[in-house]
């Protein structure tokens, strides 16, 4: 159990963040640490707690699993939006109403899209059930209209006032999924205060005749316990992203100097040889002078090491549908002065490492931590909504550094 190994890992000096936590706080156990990590993780997902339902009972829409698998297996393809949510029809009691060749299907969706997200696209997926005489080659030709049902206030209590979202024709030869663009309505819903919204689907014969069994039937599958329940798929993007400026850091690295090197006549090189050569010269001097650092530097300098996270192992398979686990990596090792350029040290880390070198009692070493994180794709439950994130940021270490 890879992540559980942390509990038993030897608490060597500067081995890892966990080592520091355990050595400095004797009372902390692994479960407490795991809980605090979980809380932080949930906070970033805007979740207050892990959904209580067991993943075994959650039957995500096939479409969402197909989406996840498509982008997980084909790394060259990208979805049209970073976040994809699926909302299922919540109206499990209303029956379709048939009248003069017109069949009406009321649909109800609990849709909640955060205001900071931009809705790129939304589609209503309906499974059409086609019944026709197999001896007749023709398919079933029907007119379909999808309405947004408005909240009625005042004059028309009880009336269903509706706006036309989509109007078109379906020519059905086989039962299959049909997709309709309802982006305008979902953008409207996002702006509105309420989360419960209604659509209504009308299917009617094209030529004013009552539906005739001989010409076949076309219906929408709205059965609750069914894989074919109407689905609302909302594609959105998170608009908030921050990028750090690095000019000051680079400047600090270029000015990095050991006071002990002053009397060795190395000052004159600061504007002479390149940065790498200077780093190498300083490194040689330090390695020669400090056996302990030389020993550590061989195999235990700050670097990325494998760490596979199994969601089942940490109890998160109850809300993370896919993947079952992933390679997160971790940063292990020591940050000794001088801090190499590839470890992209901060000004503070450089100073702290220097102070530690002079007086180990006064300051601890800089920490070996992730400095660049990569996203992973996840399919998870958010308040009962099956949600896919193509890029769930900050999940896997791509680079380690000293901080």
């Amino acid at each position: 159990s890879p992540i559980m190994n942390l509990e038993q890992s030897p608490l060597e000096e500067d081995m890892s963040l966990f080592g520091d936590v355990f050595s400095e706080q004797d009372g902390v156990d692994f479960n407490t640490l795991l809980q605090s990590m979980k809380d932080e993780f949930l906070k970033t997902l805007n979740l207050s707690d892990i959904p209580t339902q067991d993943s075994a009972k959650v039957d995500p829409p096939e479409y969402m699993l197909e989406l996840y698998n498509k982008f997980a297996t084909d790394r060259t393809s990208m979805p049209s939006a970073n976040i994809i949510r699926s909302f299922k029809n919540e109206d499990l009691f209303s029956q379709p109403v048939s009248f003069n060749g017109l069949r009406k299907y009321p649909l109800l969706f609990n849709v909640s899209i955060p205001h900071h997200e931009e809705v790129i696209m939304a589609e209503l997926r309906l499974y059409t059930l086609v019944q026709r005489d197999r001896m007749i080659y023709d398919g079933v030709d029907r007119k379909i209209t999808i309405f947004e049902v408005l909240e009625s206030k005042g004059d028309n209590e009880g009336e269903r006032n509706m706006l036309v979202l989509v109007s078109g024709e379906i020519y059905g030869t086989n039962s299959e999924w049909e997709t309709f663009d309802v982006t305008d309505a979902i953008r409207r819903w996002q702006k509105s205060g309420s989360s419960t919204h209604q659509l209504e689907v009308h299917i009617e014969s094209k030529h004013d005749e009552a539906e005739d069994a001989s010409s076949g039937r076309l219906e929408i599958d709205t059965s609750a316990q069914n894989k074919h329940n109407p689905l609302l798929i909302v594609f959105s993007d998170d608009q908030s992203s921050d990028k750090e400026r690095k000019e000051e850091l680079n400047e600090m690295i270029s000015h990095e100097q050991l006071p002990e090197l002053d009397n060795l006549g190395l000052d004159s090189f600061s504007s002479g040889p390149g940065e790498e050569a200077l780093l190498q010269m300083r490194s040689n001097i330090i390695y020669d002078s400090t056996a302990r650092i030389r020993r550590n530097a061989k195999g235990n300098y700050c670097k990325r090491t494998p760490l596979y996270i199994d969601f089942k192992e940490i109890g998160w398979d109850s809300w993370i549908i896919a993947p079952p686990g992933y390679e997160a990596y971790e940063c292990r090792g020591v940050c000794n002065y001088p801090l190499a350029e590839h470890l992209t040290p901060t000004k503070h880390a450089i100073i702290q490492a220097l102070v530690h070198l002079k007086n180990s009692q006064k300051a601890s070493k800089a920490c070996c931590v992730p400095t660049k994180l990569e996203p992973i794709s996840i399919l998870y439950l958010d308040k009962g909504v099956v949600t896919y994130k193509f890029k769930y940021e900050g999940m896997a270490v791509s680079e380690c550094g000293c901080r």
């Epitope: 004059d155 269903r160 006032n161 509706m162 109007s167």
Partner: antibody, heavy 115, light 111 residues
Framework: QVQLQESGPDLVQPSQTLDITCTVS????????VHWVRQPPGKGLEWMGT???????DYNSAFKDRLAISRDTSKNQVSLKMDSLQTDDTAKYFC?????????WGQGILVTVSS | QFALIQSDSMSTSAGSTVKLSCKRS????????VYWYQQHEGRSPTTMIY?????PDGVPDRFSGSIDSSSNSAFLTINDVQIEDEAVYFC??????????FGGGTKLTVL
């Protein structure tokens, strides 16, 4: 194709009743909604009321006591009836189709209220 | 009941950019849906913008709509103004109370 055509009198006596019909083609009144909007000469647009696809009707409260909107789906017609007309009711009266937004208008009928 | 306030007239030169405003007197402009209509002299209106910032098919992308909650206003921006853009522009608000309110209209003159 989609069309809306207003018909009715050009001239109405003060205190009399205005009766205008909007005949539509190319769409169904049980699918689309119809607005009535008027525009006095040289002035702005004023929403009067809406005949909803579900059969509901909304009125501008400024007209509610004297305005009645109805429809006959078999004839594809929406009617507007307004009584107690005054000279300031002189305007061009439009019907317009509301789908997700107003996408088609009639050409309007100019009604003059004068004795 | 609120009102939608538009300036009576504006003039601009061909090729320039103009921004027409529509201020909601009370209540929040963001709580309703804003439409913009163009009406040429003697003609029926046509919808240029719906839901504040959506363009119906056939409307040139020179026309764009926006909402500014700080000024409680909606805006219709016309880039690269053409002679044929000379018309009266009306804003309209539609809220979930199923009520439609028009602004007084802005007459745009293209010099």
């Amino acid at each position: 194709q989609v069309q809306l055509q207003e018909s009715g009198p050009d001239l109405v006596q003060p205190s009399q009743t205005l009766d205008i019909t909007c005949t539509v083609s190319g769409f169904s009144l049980t699918t689309y909604n119809v607005h009535w909007v008027r525009q006095p000469p040289g002035k702005g647009l004023e929403w009067m009321g809406t005949m909803w696809n579900g059969g509901g009707i909304d009125y501008n409260s400024a007209f509610k006591d004297r305005l009645a909107i109805s429809r006959d789906t078999s004839k594809n017609q929406v009617s507007l009836k307004m009584d107690s007309l005054q000279t300031d009711d002189t305007a061009k009266y439009f019907c317009a189709r509301l789908g997700y937004y107003v996408d088609y208008w009639g050409q309007g009928i100019l009604v003059t209220v004068s004795s | 009941q609120f009102a939608l306030i538009q300036s009576d007239s504006m003039s601009t030169s061909a090729g320039s950019t103009v921004k027409l405003s529509c201020k909601r007197s009370t209540g929040n402009i963001g709580s309703s849906y804003v439409y913009w209509y163009q009406q040429h002299e003697g003609r029926s209106p046509t919808t240029m913008i719906y839901d504040g910032d959506k363009r119906p098919d056939g409307v040139p992308d020179r026309f764009s709509g926006s909402i500014d909650s700080s000024s409680n206003s909606a805006f219709l921006t016309i880039n690269d103004v053409q002679i044929e853009d000379e018309a009266v522009y009306f804003c309209q608000s539609f809220s979930s109370g199923i009520k439609f309110i028009f602004g007084g209209g802005t007459k745009l003159t293209v010099l």
